[in-house]
């Protein structure tokens, strides 16, 4: 476990893992599937239209821990799930939108004119 | 140390099938995956496919699919390949190897012979 | 699927005499993760291959600081400074960054 404050790299793992990817693959992709020494995920976001898109791919190890912790950006609702333990893990995550907050519907229509 | 163990040769008749076995010790079995080359005199080598141990999760080489099929067990931390309608074009040297991001130990592999 | 090219087949070398062997790969060998994943193996007459260079450039354990791996991209090359009769044998490279994964055609290093 990481105290807080240290910057430790994450631990590399021993094998390469494969993802799923939707929307999010990269060039050395095959069959819709990604490999990494990090991460599998899933995202959720609201695109200019205020719909719902969901995205799946590979994070590299670098910079994933950041990446996987869904710190919330204002005005831009949007989830991500992340998972190591078999491959294609990221199928059977179901990330969901956070809920609209008041000052949203105020300022949704504004920021979208 | 690191130990991939294969049997030395097999001889089959033309559309048989065989399981070609490789007996991994020295390191946890689930931690790395298990690929499977082919070697023909002249040829090169061949990526067959490969297989996550922990939960069986397989890739193919396309130019192998129907061809091979590759399982483990793990509790004799042995991985196997199936190799079925065989022809003389399947007689080669197989190996299996562990692979985490590239192959760091090979097995002896397995002489295979198809002949009537 | 990604063509590795060896070159050359054949390499006459005198005991130590350095070696060079070229390996080109038909698209960049860098994957998403920023890493490149070519790799060199050494086969003897009789034997498996084992692993000499992996990604590039990193020496695998109990291999000679002789042997030295260098390139990116497309274009990468395995030098060996003193060559000794114990590394005789053939040269691949391969790369481990597409599926399906390939190999150079090797490199035969023998005595001049």
């Known amino acids: 476990k990481k105290e807080d404050g240290e910057s430790t790299a994450p631990t590399p793992r021993p094998k390469v893992l494969r993802c799923k990817c939707h929307h999010h693959c990269p060039e050395d992709s095959v069959n819709n599937i990604c490999s990494t020494d990090g991460y599998c995920f899933t995202m959720i976001e609201e695109d200019d239209s205020g719909l719902p898109v969901v995205t799946s791919g590979c994070l590299g190890l670098e910079g994933s821990d950041f990446q996987c912790r869904d710190t919330p950006i204002p005005h831009q609702r949007r989830s991500i799930e992340c998972c190591t333990e078999r491959n294609e893990c990221n199928k059977d995550l179901h990330p969901t939108l956070p809920p609209l907050k008041n000052r949203d519907f105020v300022d949704g229509p504004i920021h979208h004119r | 140390q690191v130990q991939l163990q294969q049997p030395g040769a097999e001889l089959v008749k033309p559309g048989a099938s065989v399981k070609l076995s490789c007996k991994a010790s020295?390191?946890?079995?689930?931690?790395?995956?298990m690929q499977w080359v082919k070697q023909r005199p002249g040829q090169g080598l061949e990526w067959i496919g490969e297989?996550?141990?922990?939960?069986?999760?397989?890739l193919y080489n396309q130019k192998f699919k129907g061809k091979a099929t590759l399982t483990v067990d793990t509790s004799s931390s042995t991985a196997y390949m199936q190799l079925s309608s065989l022809t003389s074009e399947d007689s080669a040297v197989y190996f299996c190897a562990r692979f985490g991001y590239y192959i760091e130990y090979w097995g002896q592999g397995t002489t295979l012979t198809v002949s009537s | 699927d990604v063509v590795m090219t060896q070159t050359p087949l054949s390499l006459p070398v005198s005991l130590g005499d350095q070696a060079s062997i070229s390996c080109r790969s038909s698209?960049?060998?860098?994957?998403?993760?920023?890493?490149?994943?070519l790799h060199w193996y050494l086969q003897k007459p009789g034997q498996s291959p084992k692993l000499l260079i992996y990604k590039v450039s990193n020496r695998f354990s109990g291999v000679p600081d002789r042997f030295s791996g260098s390139g990116s991209g497309t274009d990468f090359t395995l030098k060996i400074s003193r060559v000794e009769a114990e590394d005789l044998g053939v040269y691949f490279c391969s790369q481990s960054t597409h599926v399906p994964f390939t190999f150079g055609s090797g490199t035969k290093l023998e005595i001049k």
């Open positions: 698209q960049s060998l860098v994957h998403s993760t920023g890493n490149t994943y």
């Open positions: 297989i996550d141990p922990s939960d069986s999760y397989t």
């Open positions: 020295g390191y946890t079995f689930t931690s790395y995956w």
